[in-house]
């Protein structure tokens, strides 16, 4: 046979379903790989065959499209499972072929279990809302063709295992779930259970999305710098170890990179000959503030080192902060530190 | 200097409506959340609704939906409270108050008298 | 909607004693709780928030303390601007709720 265009296993799709649900999987190779769709791709002669590989198992076998009420299905670049079932997990291969042109992509398709309360080794999307914003909406997510428009699904809100109902800032609208003026309470796994009949059946779409509520842009400042501070002197003698912190506070800032670092007479501290030792940590408020701190210590100091300029420095999206740290040698009765 | 100073209270007949207003100042009006909280006579306080900073998102207590609606006007630095179809129950001093989820009610207005009566 | 609970109602307490104030919530309200002073014919004003942390201009003599449903102020020397009626509230979920008042008085 020809040679096949083999793209491997698509690991970026680890698409994970639930069991006894319908899902319907689009083939990777229109969305990612070729630069041209199905219809265009069938019209020009091309078929589309999907086979698997079991879960633990090394042999490739065609797709079993005969069983009983049409459980999976091909519709154009779509494989659809009326339900799953545990045992469909396993990796998925889409090959797009003719007499002579072949193209094929693998990817894993993960059946999850769901206890009654929605607990499941289940990825779930993070929706970030800021907290007190006037209203916030999320959209039940990724249940767009399982049914036609003409079908009005019946669609229930969760909050864990809590179905919503009077919930004060909480509004189910449909798809739709509405959050007016939320609140670090409003945290949390809302779930959309979504019921569509289909040829005399009833099929349930169970979506869950984790909501974080973060800091509100109006929040979002330059970086503030705790520590070190003009109040605090590191007063060392020679041969002791010499520890400054440099903590920093930033606002929670979407998508922003937050840094600190350290200079010394002005270099970063892998271009000095000192013996220093750097450690960082981080913490985060409610709301994804970030406090982190980076600790300058040096074991044993030496007269030079107390003559240095240390500086800590930070910097968001919103701008940049510098703050030198007093440091003298002990019984010395200079005080002021190198300027800047 | 922050304050707050309520205004339009008075004598309502049950059944009628009342237009409390509160003037901002001393304070970044458009980034704050703002309140209403009311105080029978004797009695305690109560939380009566809330408007998001940016004014689109509203949350009432369920003794006033339907009949109160709280609005605001960032250009004007001003906080509104119109009460309809109002009831003896209503009889109180109402303040307006600025909220933060991190400080509560962090400042509030002197307040204004309402009374519902024949 | 989260209940809210003091006690006592009343505390008779001498200038210059201690005066603890309880708060309990009917769910937890993690540390989203605040304090305020009520004296009559005035409006209230912050004194805690974030069940301990005073307020811009509150005295020291001012303390609140605990987390979850149980909450405390303490008063640790009662002066004579302190006889008022203080309001714990949560503010961890909508609707914002008060509770009750507890009126210290002088004894």
């Known amino acids: 046979s020809e040679r096949c265009d083999d793209w491997g296993l698509d690991t970026m799709r680890q698409i994970q379903v639930f069991e006894d649900e319908p899902a319907r999987i689009k083939c990777p190779l229109f969305e990612h790989f070729l630069k041209y769709n199905y219809s265009t791709a069938h019209s020009s002669g091309l078929t589309l065959i999907w086979y698997w590989t079991r879960q633990d198992r090394d042999l490739e076998e065609p797709i079993n499209f005969r069983l009983p009420e049409n459980r999976i299905s091909k519709e154009k670049d779509v494989l659809w499972f009326r339900p799953t079932l545990l045992n469909d997990t396993g990796n998925y291969t889409c090959m797009l072929r003719n007499t002579t042109y072949c193209s094929k992509v693998a990817f894993p398709l993960e059946v999850v279990q769901k206890d009654s309360c929605f607990n499941s080794a289940m990825r779930f999307p993070v929706h970030k809302m800021y907290i007190e914003h006037g209203i916030h909406k999320i959209t039940c997510p990724n249940v767009d063709g399982y049914f036609p428009s003409s079908v009005k699904p019946s669609v229930t809100w969760y909050k864990g295992c809590t179905e919503i109902v009077d919930f004060h800032n909480v509004l189910p609208e449909g798809m739709n779930l509405s959050f007016f003026i939320p609140l670090v309470s409003n945290n949390g796994n809302y779930t959309c259970v979504v019921t569509y009949p289909e040829n005399g059946r009833l099929f349930h779409l169970t979506r869950t999305v984790t909501v974080k509520v973060v800091g509100s842009p109006k929040d979002a400042l330059p970086p503030q710098i705790y520590s070190p501070n003009d109040r605090v002197v590191y007063e060392k003698e020679p041969g002791e170890e010499l520890v400054i912190p440099c903590k920093v506070y930033f606002s929670f800032i979407m998508d922003s990179h937050n840094e600190v670092w350290w200079t010394i007479d002005g270099k970063k501290p892998d271009d000095v000959t000192v013996d220093i030792t750097i450690n960082e940590s981080v913490s985060y408020s409610s709301t994804e503030d970030e406090t982190r701190t980076q600790i300058l210590s040096i074991k044993k100091v030496t007269p030079e080192d107390l003559r240095r300029n240390y500086v800590c420095h930070a910097r968001n999206t919103k701008g940049e902060a510098e703050q030198a740290a007093k440091v003298k040698q002990k019984g010395n009765g200079c005080t002021e530190p190198m300027t800047l | 200097e922050v304050q707050l100073l309520e205004s339009g209270g008075g004598l309502v007949q049950p059944g009628g409506s009342l237009r409390l207003s509160c003037a901002a100042s001393g304070f970044i009006f458009s980034h704050y959340g703002m309140s209403w909280v009311r105080q029978a006579p004797g009695k305690g306080l109560e939380w009566v609704s809330a408007?998001?900073?940016?004014?689109?998102?509203?949350l009432y207590a369920d003794s006033v939906k339907g009949r109160f609606t709280i609005s605001r006007d960032n250009s004007k630095n001003t906080l509104y409270l119109q009460m309809n179809s109002l009831r003896a129950e209503d009889t109180a001093v109402y303040y307006c108050a600025r909220f933060r989820y991190y400080t509560a009610f962090d400042y509030w207005g002197q307040g204004t008298l309402v009374t519902v009566s024949s | 909607e989260i209940v809210m609970t003091q006690s006592p109602a009343t505390l008779s307490v001498s200038p210059g004693e201690r005066a603890t104030l309880s708060c309990r919530a009917s769910?937890?309200?993690?540390?989203?709780l605040a304090w305020y002073q009520q004296k009559p014919g005035q409006a209230p004003r912050l004194l805690i928030y974030?069940?301990?942390t005073r307020a811009t201009g509150i005295p020291a003599r001012f303390s609140g303390s605990g987390s979850g449903t149980e909450f405390t102020l303490t008063i640790s020397s009662l002066q004579s601007e302190d006889f008022a009626v203080y309001y714990c509230q949560q503010y961890n979920n909508w609707p914002w709720t008060f509770g009750q008042g507890t009126k210290v008085e002088i004894k």
């Open positions: 769910q937890s309200v993690s540390s989203n």
């Open positions: 408007i998001s900073y940016d004014g689109e998102g509203t």
């Open positions: 974030g069940a301990s």
